[in-house]
Interface confidence: medium
Amino acid sequence: DYKDDDDKGWVWNQFFVPEEMNTTSHHIGQLRSDLDNGNNSFQYKLLGAGAGSTFIIDERTGDIYAIQKLDREERSLYILRAQVIDIATGRAVEPESEFVIKVSDINDNEPRFLDEPYEAIVPEMSPEGTFVIKVTANDADDPSTGYHARILYNLERGQPYFSVEPTTGVIRISSKMDRELQDTYCVIIQAKDMLGQPGALSGTTTVSIKLSDINDNKPIFKESFYRFTISESAPIGTSIGKIMAYDDDIGENAEMEYSIEDDDSKIFDIIIDNDTQEGIVILKKKVDFEQQSYYGIRAKVKNCHVDEELAPAHVNASTTYIKVQVEDEDEPPVFLLPYYILEIPEGKPYGTIVGTVSATDPDRRQSPMRYYLTGSKMFDINDNGTIITTNMLDREVSAWYNLTVTATETYNVQQISSAHVYVQVFNINDNAPEFSQFYETYVCENAESGEIVQIISAIDRDESIEDHHFYFNHSLEDTNNSSFMLTDNQDNTAVILSNRTGFNLKEEPVFYMIILIADNGIPSLTSTNTLTIQVCDCGDSRNTETCANKGLLFIMGFRTE
């Protein structure tokens, strides 16, 4: 028995009640006063949290009972107060005393993994002993009672690749794994309390372990030989065909690059399709069946990213042989020149040969040609490619002709090619000079001798290699016209001067002056031009601007050419 030092009359045992008792009334012990002689004169009372609901006292004997199942993990200690009263007087026999009921642990809680789900990633081919993940189980039981909360970990599933340290829950690799064979492992770890002894409770957890990829595989061509065909007419950049290598690795480790080997002509190239990792063989230069009908090239494939320590796995890169057959294409005719410039003098009779164009069939059969000409009705072409005139050409009408010659193969009229032919008509001196404009010339009645009446100039429709040079002269035939004289200024202009003082409008209202103009062509051409001079009433001034009858003659139509 235990006697409380402060409350000397109280006697009780240490009170323990096992948790999880299924009985509805469990006797815990007895509280009594040493003054109680057993004649039922005392009444015992229980106070505090749990009194009357969880714990009950027999008022007569002081026996204490637990009437509810207790859970140590919920509450491990109850502090209650006891009273003992004399029934006769209603007074306390002893001072109120505090006592403790301890709930003793049973192993009723299994270890639980609170951090689920467990997921880990570890590189494939990791060596034995590599740390993967640590799992931890918790046991709600009392760690100070036996081994109720002492946990041992055990691998239920995952051998022979993984192991677990029994006391720490650290999972390690115990055998190398190849992601390309299996990429995910499901490991089951069991945690047992009681250090795994009989009566132990257990809990399990699943650990999902993913192997991350390392670049331990080189790409290998699916086929050792590829045959492709390409038309000789295919433009640069044309895709000839696809080659494919496979790599058991994933992601960046499977990224590959293709290259062309043994292609001295540098006709082909390989680009990669990043989505499919296929190599696309493309044309880098034009091919010509007549020049070479097939090509044999070799392609190589290797990874883009290789770690130094994994380089040994990537020696002897995979190669494949590619045969490219060039298909003969019925090609259109080819002109000897990309364009032609021909010359012909103007004024030649129709049927004159301008020049010859020539096209040939690049194919082996060398088809004869047929030619067609468009762009002008002044020309025609025969089956030999000779261009002739169909009219006399006048440079002053057209100095250039832009013609198109079309050549078709006789055997296949669908095969057509065209070339531009530029015909230049060059000048011959076939145009005499003439007045550059129509002159309305006036002379005042009171004009003085030597006075300038008109400055004239000329034009010539001919083309001149050097600058035109014109010569002016008074026609020898114009004997009756001595009232005016002409002076050549030597600059392609001439001046008409009055050769007398005074004119009479009424007597001689109009003068016609015949002027000869010659060019400097070979041979020189001369024209006769008439200048009409009207006498004018200028009043007191000698300025033709004030002429009263100005323009009347020209308006009335007395103009003579």
Partner: antibody
Framework: QVQLVQSGAEVKKPGASVKVSCKAS????????MSWVRQAPGQGLEWMGI????????TYAQKFQGRVTMTRDTSTSTVYMELSSLRSEDTAVYYC?????????????WGQGTLVTVSS | QSVLTQPPSASGTPGQRVTISCSGS????????VNWYQQLPGTAPKLLIY???QRPSGVPDRFSGSKSGTSASLAISGLQSEDEADYYC???????????FGGGTKLTVLG
Amino acid sequence: QVQLVQSGAEVKKPGASVKVSCKASGYTFTSYYMSWVRQAPGQGLEWMGIIHPSGGDTTYAQKFQGRVTMTRDTSTSTVYMELSSLRSEDTAVYYCARGGIKLWLHFDYWGQGTLVTVSS
Amino acid sequence: QSVLTQPPSASGTPGQRVTISCSGSRSNIGSNFVNWYQQLPGTAPKLLIYTNNQRPSGVPDRFSGSKSGTSASLAISGLQSEDEADYYCAVWDDSLNGWVFGGGTKLTVLG
């Protein structure tokens, strides 16, 4: 596990006495009260009294005062109920039941019952 | 004549909810804990509910007890055929200084 095993059926004449035993096992005998409850044929339950095996203290229902005696033998963990001056209306099944102190304690375990027939 | 009053009978079909009442006075239900017992035909009574609303282990949670003032009730939800039995309420009576039982209610599961 807790078990209460009662003695066999009895047939008694009016005026006689009957003593029914109840042997307890599976728990600390002296820590729990024992009550006696009877049930007449086709009738309800009727509480007769209680004994504390530790000190032998008893409390009897008013109706049976003077006619019933409850005793115990701690050495054999057995309680006894003796009913005297039997009448025909005492014909019933008599049960011992663990528990029954004031205020709280219920009857958590019951014996299988003993049929007492009072007949002339 | 019992100190505690119970209806003599009650019935329900499987799956239904049935309530059995127990009426007393201040000296019994009004002052003390109520217990309920189930007695299957030909067997000893069995503790069903103690201290008003507690269920011993092994008793299904379809059974529940409650107390209010001087009355108590037992509710059975999701009625099953094996629930067919007599049900008794019991409580300590301070005036009589002893245990009193209700007259019992015979529960019949129909159909």
